[in-house]
């Protein structure tokens, strides 16, 4: 079945074009094609191609990037790229990353403030609770799948030969040494940033200093700010601030409208950036392949570990998550996935959940019919705490290292790996240097050697991309599930008490002169002839 198109208050498919530079689907027929419907006649094929142009371009970009990367690295000679030429080669990709990162801060803050302010506290709590439950369950499932696959395929035993080439001295110095408690305290500290401005580009992290105290060397924890956006702190602040604005009633109305307008403007920018995405993705993928030294040897040595991770991600992303989606919604999950191919490819190209967030919001709203207040509330939270891919990879890596170093894993240790991987993947956004540090935490929790983390890092460029794709897919399907939950609860209840979008129905309506109104919104005249209701906004559901 075709994913439901976004509907206006009368239940009709939204017919007006969106500001996505031609991405908008003009009719129900086209929407069917865009959502992966059958394209029969030549006319339909043309329409189908036009509707899916960006998706196709993005997929082509990934393939072209791989081909270009292999071509350049294989050619060598005059084409051989030194560090300075490589940075020039990757520049178009770097530009995409910079554009997406530029958008993240206003998008996350404004969408969450707007989203939290649009929901009544009861609905907000329910929606948040269901989202967190979905994220937790799917992350646990991913962890279990990772452990199961690694125990079955035994990548560590197969890859034991790599030990010999790495040498006995491993590379423990590459493994960050940090107390588990300090990692989680840092997570809590980052949830409550002391400075909102610095949270936009810095996170709190504990390091250690050795001090001589009464003749004994003692390791003293020292807090410091490190480079990297504290997304967790911003997310928490934005949600709480949104709730506070709603509490203000009429006084907070103007500010809510400001954030919603800011958000809309940001989404227009996103729709422009989307068309540049294929170019950027192609060069990011190509650049990474060119950068890798002896990919063949790496695959020969770590092939089974890579296979284990990628197979796990494929099973979870193409079977487990879609099955959960289908069981709860009775809708075709693959139609849903087709609607988010562009952000999934972007996730693969950029290897960043938060950089993919703007495109994901755009696509789930326009292609998969997820209401704005749901997508803009759930997706930023998902990008922060939902990391199925990371949890799966960490579990595979932990079992891989156990097998590699011939250390036993009993039932208690396996449970510990599952729980720690789930917990630390949720907290990874609040822990600077996420992936590797959280893996070190898991290894410490079950007394496994950290020497081999350097091996994991050697293929992180590939596995991390796959992780990111799975992470963002989980976020999107979570948003789709919650949309379905909201639809069901609404159809059951006589009065739609769940959600009220404040920017549409102000408690104390402000006159909006046409010339001063939001240029992104068309206004239509209500029965009384006033132009206060915005047709682009979601109505009461």
């Amino acid at each position: 079945m075709v994913a439901d198109p976004p509907r206006d208050s009368k239940g009709l498919a939204a017919a007006e074009p969106t500001a996505n530079g031609g991405l908008a689907l003009a009719s129900i027929e086209d929407q069917g094609a865009a959502a992966g419907g059958y394209c029969g006649s030549r006319d339909q094929v043309r329409r189908c191609l036009r509707a899916n142009l960006l998706v196709l371009l993005t997929v082509v970009a990934v393939v072209a990037g791989v081909a270009l990367g292999l071509g350049v690295s294989g050619a060598g000679g005059a084409l051989a790229l030194g560090p300075e030429r490589l940075s020039a080669f990757v520049f178009p990709g770097e530009l995409l990353l910079r554009l997406l990162r530029m958008i993240i801060l206003p998008l996350v803050v404004c969408s969450l403030i707007g989203g939290a302010a649009s929901l009544d506290p009861g609905a907000l709590g329910r929606l948040g609770a269901w989202a967190l439950l979905f994220f937790l369950v799917t992350t646990l499932l991913a962890s279990a799948l990772g452990v199961g696959l690694a125990l079955a395929l035994q990548p560590g035993a197969a890859s034991a030969a790599i030990n010999a080439s790495v040498g006995a001295a491993g590379s423990a110095e590459n493994a960050p040494s940090k107390e588990v408690l300090d990692s989680f305290l840092d997570l809590a500290r980052n949830i409550f940033p002391s400075n909102l401005v610095s949270a936009a580009f810095r996170s709190y992290s504990t390091t250690y200093e050795e001090r001589n105290i009464t003749g004994t060397r003692v390791k003293v924890p020292v807090g410091q700010e490190v480079e990297g956006m504290n997304i967790l702190g911003l997310v928490v602040f934005a949600i709480v601030f949104g709730v506070a604005l709603r509490k203000l009633g009429p006084e907070g109305e103007l500010l809510i409208r400001f954030f919603n307008s800011f958000n809309e403007a940001t989404m227009v920018l996103v729709s422009w950036i989307m068309w540049y995405a294929p170019v950027g993705i192609m060069f990011l993928v190509a650049g990474k392949i060119v950068e890798m030294e002896d990919v063949g040897l790496l695959f020969a040595r770590l092939g089974k570990y890579i296979l284990c991770c990628l197979l796990g991600h494929a099973i979870h992303g193409l079977l487990v998550l879609p099955l959960i989606y289908f069981l709860f919604t009775r809708k075709n999950p693959y139609r849903f996935l087709w609607g988010i191919v562009t952000p999934l490819a972007t996730a693969f190209g950029t290897s960043s959940s938060s950089a993919t967030l703007p495109l994901m919001m755009k696509c789930v709203e326009e292609n998969n019919g997820v209401a704005k207040h749901i997508s803009r509330f759930i997706l930023p939270i998902g990008a922060t705490v939902n990391m199925d891919g990371a949890a799966l990879f960490q579990c595979v890596a932990a079992v891989f290292i156990a097998q590699l170093s011939q250390q036993s894993l009993d039932f208690v240790k396996i449970i510990t790996i599952l729980v720690t991987a789930t917990a630390s993947s949720v907290g990874a956004a609040g822990i600077p240097a996420g992936g590797v540090l959280t893996l070190a935490i898991i290894l410490e929790a079950v007394n496994l050697p950290v020497d081999h983390i350097s091996l994991i890092l050697a293929v992180d460029w590939l596995v991390d991309r796959s992780c990111t794709v799975l992470n963002v897919e989980g976020d999107a399907l979570g948003a789709g599930l919650l949309q379905n939950y909201v639809d069901r609860t609404e159809s059951r209840s006589t009065e739609p008490e769940l959600i009220q979008v404040k920017s549409e129905l102000p408690l104390d309506p402000l006159p909006v002169p046409t010339e001063e109104g939001n240029p992104l919104l068309k206004h239509y005249r209500g029965p009384a002839g006033d132009a206060t209701v915005a047709s682009e906004k979601e109505s009461v559901m």
């Epitope: 035993a157 010999a164 423990a172 011939q406 007394n447 050697p449």
Partner: antibody, heavy 120, light 107 residues
């Protein structure tokens, strides 16, 4: 009970090879890694490396790459240490030690040691 | 590689004495510290692993403690069979390294 029984003492000339065996009993051989440790006369203990008994893959310490070879015969639960082109400084007691399967790197059971003397 | 420094290098004690041997690592080894006993002409025997856990069959008069870089082995009441050389060993990272040994002699 767990037992590691090593081959007897060896007296070799410089340049000759030697092969020391370590037969394990009392546990599943392929479950635990086997390490080799050297103790030169009047000196401390020095870890030489270990062999992954399930995969049969050797891992050598930095000072023991080249002339030293670890091998296995899993059918008789035996690990071997082979040293080629012996030098006078190879004179030492060589121990095989079972690597514990927990708490990273420690050795819970040791062979009785094989004394190797290299002299012309 | 992580350096392990034992002190003292030798010590004399009488039967029934309480003896403490210390071991210092060149960096934090996160409790992955093990103690071995070796008698002349014999193989080392594991006494304590992971700082304080007694290996099976080891008398309870042996105990271990410490954290970070500093660790100790304590024998609460010396017995005749305890006179030997004691080695500490870090198992935190490859390569595992041993202390130079502490020779415990009868006074």
């Amino acid at each position: 009970q767990v037992q590691l029984v090593q081959s007897g003492s060896e007296l070799k000339k410089p340049g000759a090879p030697v092969k020391i065996s370590c037969k394990a009993s009392g546990y599943t051989f392929s479950t635990f890694g086997m390490s080799w440790v050297r103790q030169a006369p009047g000196q401390g203990l020095k870890w030489m490396g270990w062999i992954h008994t399930y995969a049969g893959v050797p891992i050598y310490g930095d000072d023991f790459k080249g002339r030293f070879v670890f091998s296995l015969d899993t059918s008789v639960s035996t690990a071997y240490l082979q040293i080629s082109s012996l030098k006078a400084e190879d004179t030492a007691v060589y121990f095989c030690a079972r690597r514990s399967d927990n708490y990273r790197y420690f050795f819970d059971y040791w062979g009785q040691g094989t004394t190797l003397t290299v002299s012309s | 590689d992580i350096q392990m420094t034992q002190s003292p290098s030798s010590l004399s004690a009488s039967l029934g004495d309480r003896v403490t041997i210390t071991c210092r690592a060149s960096q934090d080894i996160r409790n992955y510290l093990n103690w071995y006993q070796q008698k002349p002409g014999k193989a080392p025997k594991l006494l304590i692993y992971y700082t304080s856990r007694l290996h099976s069959g080891v008398p309870s008069r042996f105990s271990g403690s410490g954290s970070g870089t500093d660790y100790t082995l304590t024998i609460s009441s010396l017995q005749p069979e305890d006179f030997a050389t004691y080695f500490c060993q870090q198992g935190h990272t490859l390569p595992p390294t041993f202390g130079q040994g502490t020779k415990l002699e009868i006074k």
